[in-house]
């Protein structure tokens, strides 16, 4: 039961995370004009990964796409790439995890296959979340660098009669959405991996070989990878004797105790 809950929750958390990554990638507010002491501005600039926008106090908003690939900074291209990779991996992970969910029955798919799919989707979510966090962090670092550079420029070359209003940019809402979404996707991925570990012992059990001691008709199950190292006896960590003579087929048909932890 706990495995199903962990898997389901991991799926939902990752779904929210990936939706957030998509939202962040599409948002225009990756960087917003720093208003420092003036909360009201006649012209407000903000930029996204795909276009830059200007909102006038008149309410008029104009956005212009970046219609060049070669003319864009390499860092911006890298951030775009990281976010897209994150979305693609996350989307594939979601697709895989749907079929891996314990609560969904698809034909005669074995739990071992579901465990593998759960682990695969979990890893995909982890990588997806890391890509998003990396992308947002790279952009944030770029902003911080540019912010201090433009701040330095504001206080140099002021000797002349004409001053240039230097537009400084600070963190936009998309950065925070991206960080949170990346984190959620990462957490969801970890939960999927934990759920996989809960599923996996049973798979090894099902493939166990029955050892028949002389004069007894008792089946012994060697401990799974979760409970033991796989070497020697396993009396300390896991009860391996079921207390009744059952065949492998019978053992397989009973519900796993891991479902009710």
């Amino acid at each position: 039961m706990a495995v199903t809950a962990c898997q389901g929750l991991g799926f939902v958390v990752s779904l929210i995370g990936i939706a957030g990554i998509i939202a962040a990638t599409c948002m225009d507010q990756w960087s917003t004009q720093d208003l420092y002491n003036n909360p009201v501005t006649a012209v407000f600039n903000y930029q996204g990964l795909w276009r830059s926008c200007v909102r006038e106090s008149s309410g008029f908003t104009e956005c212009r796409g970046y219609f060049t690939l070669l003319g864009l900074p390499a860092m911006l291209q890298a951030v775009r790439a990281l976010m897209i990779v994150g979305i693609v991996l996350g989307a594939i992970g979601l697709l895989v995890s749907i079929f891996a969910l314990k609560c969904i029955r698809i034909g005669s798919m074995e739990d071992s296959a579901k465990a593998n799919m759960t682990l695969t989707s979990g890893i995909m979510f982890i990588v997806s979340g890391l890509c998003a966090i990396a992308g947002v962090s790279v952009f944030a670092n770029m902003l911080v660098t540019n912010f201090w550079m433009s701040t330095a420029n504001m206080y140099t070359g002021m000797g002349g009669m004409v001053q240039t209003v230097q537009t400084r940019y600070t963190f936009g809402a998309a950065l925070f959405v991206g960080w949170v979404a990346g984190g959620l996707t990462l957490i969801g991925g970890v939960m999927m991996c934990i759920a996989c570990r809960g599923l996996a012992p049973e798979e090894t059990n099902y493939k166990a070989v029955s050892y028949h001691a002389s004069g007894h008709s008792v089946a012994y199950k060697p401990g799974g990878f979760k409970a033991s190292t796989g070497f020697g006896s396993n009396t300390k960590n896991k009860k391996i004797y079921d207390g009744g003579a059952r065949t492998e087929d019978e053992v397989q048909s009973y519900p796993s105790k891991h479902d009710y932890v």
């Epitope: 600039n45 903000y46 830059s52 006038e56 008149s58 008029f60 212009r64």
Partner: antibody, heavy 118, light 113 residues
Framework: EVQLVQSGAEVKKPGASVKVSCKAS????????MHWVRQAPGQRLEWIGM????????NYNEKFKGKATLTLDKSASTAYMELSSLRSEDTAVYYC???????????WGQGTTVTVSS | DIVLTQSPDSLAVSLGERATINCKSS????????????LTWYQQKPGQPPKLLIY???TRESGVPDRFSGSGSGTDFTLTISSLQAEDVAVYYC?????????FGQGTKLEIK
């Protein structure tokens, strides 16, 4: 047709207060910032401040903080500017104006002359 | 605050001739975000409120005759009337529309020679 109709001329004594009105018609009142500008005799135009009829938020020129107070009556599509502690230097024509694209004023009231004289 | 200085203070031009009014800003009015210059030109006739002629330094307001044109970028701007008409006699103002507080030039009085 967009129209901004202001209240009539006022003559006030120094230290008194005056409230000028600006009634808007022909457009959605709550969609545009309303600005106030003054023109003293022989002086350049001076921006006083602005108010958004939807949110009621205001922004003033530092020079007019404490001097001008902008309010509105949404139901009557009317903006008001109250000038307090009047002095002879406040003698001017006061305009309300609607802000449009390019942060420019496309429609202006006809102007209200405020004369401060003892 | 941004200071706008117009030149000349007054200008006399013959009918049908070109009239040029300059406006210089103490700070750049060019917005890097959209590469637009936030300078506006107004015409004011005696006893009337100002009338919008040009915004974004060069965009003519609808209904304004095409003999009026605006140019310039950054800190230096020009209003040109290609062929002066009698009805163009007025005072012309430039306005900073880039930062608050909005500021205006001192005005240029245009007369017929």
């Amino acid at each position: 047709e967009v129209q901004l109709v202001q209240s009539g001329a006022e003559v006030k004594k120094p230290g008194a207060s005056v409230k000028v009105s600006c009634k808007a018609s022909g457009y959605t009142f709550t969609s545009y910032w309303m600005h106030w500008v003054r023109q003293a005799p022989g002086q350049r135009l001076e921006w006083i401040g602005m108010i958004h009829p939807n949110s009621g938020s205001t922004n003033y020129n530092e020079k007019f903080k404490g001097k001008a107070t902008l309010t509105l009556d949404k139901s009557a599509s009317t903006a008001y500017m109250e000038l307090s502690s009047l002095r002879s230097e406040d003698t001017a024509v006061y305009y309300c104006a609607r802000l449009k694209t390019g942060n420019s004023f496309d429609y202006w009231g006809q102007g209200t002359t405020v004369t401060v004289s003892s | 605050d941004i200071v706008l200085t117009q030149s000349p203070d007054s200008l006399a031009v013959s009918l049908g001739e070109r009239a040029t009014i300059n406006c210089k800003s103490s700070q750049s009015l060019l917005n890097s975000g959209n590469q637009k210059n936030y300078l506006t030109w107004y015409q004011q006739k005696p006893g009337q409120p100002p009338k919008l002629l040009i915004y974004w330094a060069s965009t003519r307001e609808s209904g304004v005759p095409d003999r009026f044109s605006g140019s310039g970028s950054g800190t230096d701007f020009t209003l040109t009337i290609s062929s002066l008409q009698a009805e163009d006699v007025a005072v012309y103002y430039c306005q900073n529309a880039y930062t608050y507080p909005f500021t205006f030039g001192q005005g240029t009085k245009l007369e017929i020679k």
